[in-house]
């Protein structure tokens, strides 16, 4: 999505703010930041690798290269999510992670990338010939999906050595463009600073009318919630076929959060509120999120051994005490 930043009009500096270098200096960094963040088209990446240590284990890693905040990630196999693919895991930045066998461990790697370990039964299993897809619902970009599969020669001995995730990869043109804008901005800021140095600063009048502007907080799960999202263990299905429908979910819509794999000590944010909300197979990510939040506090219809139930209707966060975010 190529979006152009709306650059606010630079107003003449107010007399009372001249000592603080006026609006111009304060506005410019934000304008530059907006230009940098909104430049370029989002890209989604998927990497599928067979673990050299365990021949039956696959690692799927996905990431979103865009400016928006991720609101939901869906990992599926057998094709794209809305077209015959079977959901393996759903990751929400705040509400936690849900996964189905044969997914073994889904987790956030960064705010915009995830990884999923999949348990198979060797290279000859159906997994070795399967397409894995990741769909990122992000605001404001919308939904973006990419798919990947194992290379034809999936012998771990022959495969390329593991390389760092392409999270920080960007096109040279993009880097140069952003660098140029930033360099120009820095030079301009230095010019303003120098000009300000040579100008005698008038006395600052304390402003009675303008309260201190609240500091904007960027979207990002905290370190604690990031750690809480990591699911340590899940049901392992040694065959690479999807589990039967009574334990997993039909193609159209999974039996949501019915047997949430969770670790009581490790996952304070495990969502009981997510227990049995049906998700539309298609539709915008807004409707998906609305569906997830619709039945907050409802008890799941059947619970597996791994499910931690939170009796408080407000969900798990109500039990967190002083550390919980209300």
């Amino acid at each position: 999505m190529r979006t152009e930043a709306q650059v606010p009009a630079l107003q003449p500096p107010e007399p009372g703010l001249e000592g603080a270098m006026g609006h111009r200096t304060l506005v410019l960094p934000w304008v530059l930041l907006t230009l940098c963040v909104t430049a370029g088209t989002p890209e989604v990446w998927v990497q599928v690798r067979m673990e050299a240590t365990e021949l039956s284990s696959f690692t799927i890693r996905c990431g979103f290269l865009g400016s928006g905040s991720i609101s939901l990630v869906t990992v599926s196999w057998g094709g794209p999510n809305g077209a015959g693919g079977t959901t393996l895991a759903v990751l929400h930045p705040e509400r936690g992670i849900r996964q189905w066998a044969p997914a073994r461990q889904a987790r956030w790697e960064t705010q915009s990338s995830i990884s999923l370990i999949l348990e198979g039964s060797g290279a000859s299993s159906p997994c070795a010939n399967t397409t894995f897809c990741c769909k990122f619902a992000s605001f404001p970009e919308g939904s973006w999906e990419a798919c990947g599969s194992l290379p034809p020669s999936s012998d771990p001995g022959l495969s390329a050595p593991p390389t760092p995730a392409p999270i920080l990869r960007a096109d040279l043109a993009g880097i140069l463009g952003v660098s140029g804008v930033l360099l120009f901005g820095c030079v301009y800021l230095l010019h303003l600073l120098r000009r300000h140095k040579h100008r005698p600063a008038p006395r600052l009048q304390p402003s009675r009318t303008s309260p201190q502007a609240p500091r904007a907080r960027a979207w990002a799960p905290s370190q604690a919630s990031q750690a809480a999202l990591h699911v340590p263990y899940a049901t392992i299905n040694t065959s690479c076929r999807p589990a039967t429908l009574d334990t997993a979910h039909p193609h159209g819509g999974p039996s949501w959060w019915a047997s949430l794999p969770t670790h009581a000590a490790h996952r304070p944010q495990g969502p009981a509120a997510w227990a049995s909300t049906p998700i539309p197979a298609r539709g915008s990510f807004v409707s998906v999120e609305n569906g997830l939040y619709a039945q907050a506090g409802e008890r799941p219809p059947h619970t597996g051994p791994g499910l931690t139930l939170f009796p408080d209707p407000r969900g798990p966060r109500a039990m967190e005490g002083p550390l919980g975010v209300r």
């Epitope: 088209t41 890209e43 989604v44 999906e145 798919c147 990947g148 390329a160 390389t163 096109d171």
Partner: nanobody, 127 residues
Framework: QVQLVESGGGLVQAGGSLRLSCVAS????????MAWFRQAPGKEREFVAY???????????SYADFVKGRFTAFRDNTRNTMYLQMNRLRPEDTAVYYC?????????????????WGQGTQVTVSS
């Protein structure tokens, strides 16, 4: 040169789905980026989606604004076929869809960046 053959087009009702295929033959190993373009009658050819890949088996995908999560471009693990899964089709998606391949690496949105083209497959979405 890479030879590309598209298939999977046809007539579909609005809201329906289609999956287009593009089979590559020839010097397929030299193609690093494959894309879908479309051309509606009386309009210019426009970028729909691309998929590109790297040596560490990482697949990337990017899409045009109008796709808005409805289409998914991907390839199978034999690396010889690329697909365009089209969901929630609209009448304005009616066009001839072309598969294209570029032999150099990059994030390409312009038709001029691609040096191999298929003959196209017609997609008609009726309201």
């Amino acid at each position: 040169q890479v030879q590309l053959v598209e298939s999977g087009g046809g007539l579909v009702q609005a809201g329906g789905s289609l999956r287009l295929s593009c089979v590559a033959s020839g010097r397929t190993f030299s193609a690093n980026t494959m894309a879908w373009f479309r051309q509606a009658p009386g309009k210019e050819r426009e970028f729909v989606a691309y998929t590109r890949w790297t040596d560490d088996n990482t697949d990337y995908a990017s899409y045009a604004d109008f796709v808005k999560g409805r289409f998914t471009a991907f390839r199978d693990n034999t690396r010889n076929t690329m697909y365009l899964q089209m969901n929630r089709l609209r009448p304005e998606d009616t066009a001839v869809y072309y598969c294209a391949a570029a032999t150099t690496r990059g994030t390409y949105y312009s038709a001029g960046d691609y040096n191999s083209w298929g003959q196209g497959t017609q997609v008609t979405v009726s309201s």
